[in-house]
């Protein structure tokens, strides 16, 4: 079947922003919202924010959770407000996404 190929501008959503990449802001606007948890030097690092680049969100959000990192994504205004990413209790390790371009 032929693709529909809609010609639309991407919808932007307001997202909760928490973590170092947010600076002094408590929200950001992007094409997807996320909530993440990673282990850094033994500490649990929680972050929330948005993907301004759709493809970055698309790729990051399809990355399966690993013992060292988990990301949950959503589309909708403030949709990440009540989402807390959780690490799997067991599972194989995964390279993850080390090169976030969060701006």
């Amino acid at each position: 079947m032929e693709d529909e190929k809609p010609k639309v501008n991407p919808k932007l959503y307001m997202c909760v922003c928490e973590g170092l990449s947010c600076g002094n802001e408590d929200h950001c606007e992007g094409q997807q919202c996320f909530s993440s948890l990673s282990i850094n030097d033994g500490f649990h690092v929680y972050q929330k924010g948005c993907f301004q680049v759709y493809e970055q969100g698309k790729m990051t959000c399809k990355t399966p959770p690993s013992p060292g990192q988990a990301v949950e994504c959503c589309q909708g205004d403030w949709c990440n407000r009540n989402i807390t990413a959780q690490l799997p209790t067991k599972g194989k390790s995964f390279p993850g996404t080390q090169n976030f371009h969060l701006e």
């Epitope: 190929k5 493809e55 698309k58 790729m59 399809k62 993850g96 996404t97 090169n99 371009h101 701006e103």
Partner: antibody, heavy 119, light 107 residues
Framework: EVQLQQSGAELVRPGASVRLSCTAS????????MHWVKQRPEQGLEWIGW????????KYAPNFQDKATITAVTSSNTAYLQLSSLTSEDSAIYYC????????????WGQGTSVTVSS | DIQMTQSPASQSASLGESVTFTCLAS??????LAWYQQKPGKSPQLLIY???SLADGVPSRFSGSGSGTKFSFKISSLQAEDFASYYC?????????FGGGTKLEIK
């Protein structure tokens, strides 16, 4: 080893359609976005679009919206580019490339498929 | 669409020299920029991603800098295998667009 193997050169008539293939090895295309790029002789690169093989979502450059259709078959780890209503302007080399969360860019490219449109 | 203006279109240089190319984006793209090398008859090869990061296996004589709208790409101490065409690409907003390319030739 990551490899993208593209189908062979095509000589096609104006007005016809052609389907090019790009078979991946060394990774699962479901874990990436598969892109297609056009390069005309002695000219630069033009991004055509991508497909997410996992869910079939596609995105196209406006110039290729009515020209190109990108599909993928995950069972054979292959992405396809179909070009329709061909004209001489479509004569070019077409590359497939993958985009992953390793670099958030197109890190591996196929060897290219030459398409010549001529009567 | 975001326009990418790459300069110069061509440049001649000698072995051992350094060269720098520039890419200007028509609007801010953060660090969503890649640089590729392409040799005649071959497919492009990723050199730099995220404006400044070197891809795996790429020699350290290649480097990238810049953010926002102005980006630079430098090759220090040119080797024979570096004579090729180079393209920048923005990945901030679709349609992803490439610069017109720089053809680097031996002087």
């Amino acid at each position: 080893e990551v490899q993208l193997q593209q189908s062979g050169a095509e000589l096609v008539r104006p007005g016809a359609s052609v389907r090019l293939s790009c078979t991946a090895s060394g990774f699962n295309i479901k874990d990436s976005l598969m892109h297609w790029v056009k390069q005309r002789p002695e000219q630069g690169l033009e991004w055509i679009g991508w497909i997410d093989p996992e869910d079939g979502e596609t995105k196209y450059a406006p110039n290729f919206q009515d020209k190109a259709t990108i599909t993928a078959v995950t069972s054979s780890n292959t992405a396809y580019l179909q070009l329709s209503s061909l004209t001489s302007e479509d004569s070019a080399i077409y590359y497939c490339a993958r985009y992953t969360s390793d670099y958030y860019t197109m890190d591996y490219w196929g060897q290219g498929t030459s398409v010549t449109v001529s009567s | 669409d975001i326009q990418m203006t790459q300069s110069p279109a061509s440049q001649s240089a000698s072995l051992g020299e350094s060269v720098t190319f520039t890419c200007l984006a028509s609007q801010t793209i953060g660090t969503w920029l890649a640089w590729y090398q392409q040799k005649p008859g071959k497919s492009p090869q990723l050199l730099i991603y995220a404006a400044t990061s070197l891809a795996d296996g790429v020699p350290s004589r290649f480097s990238g800098s810049g953010s926002g709208t102005k980006f630079s790409f430098k090759i220090s101490s040119l080797q024979a295998e570096d004579f090729a065409s180079y393209y920048c690409q923005q990945l901030y907003s679709t349609p992803w667009t490439f610069g017109g390319g720089t053809k680097l030739e031996i002087k």
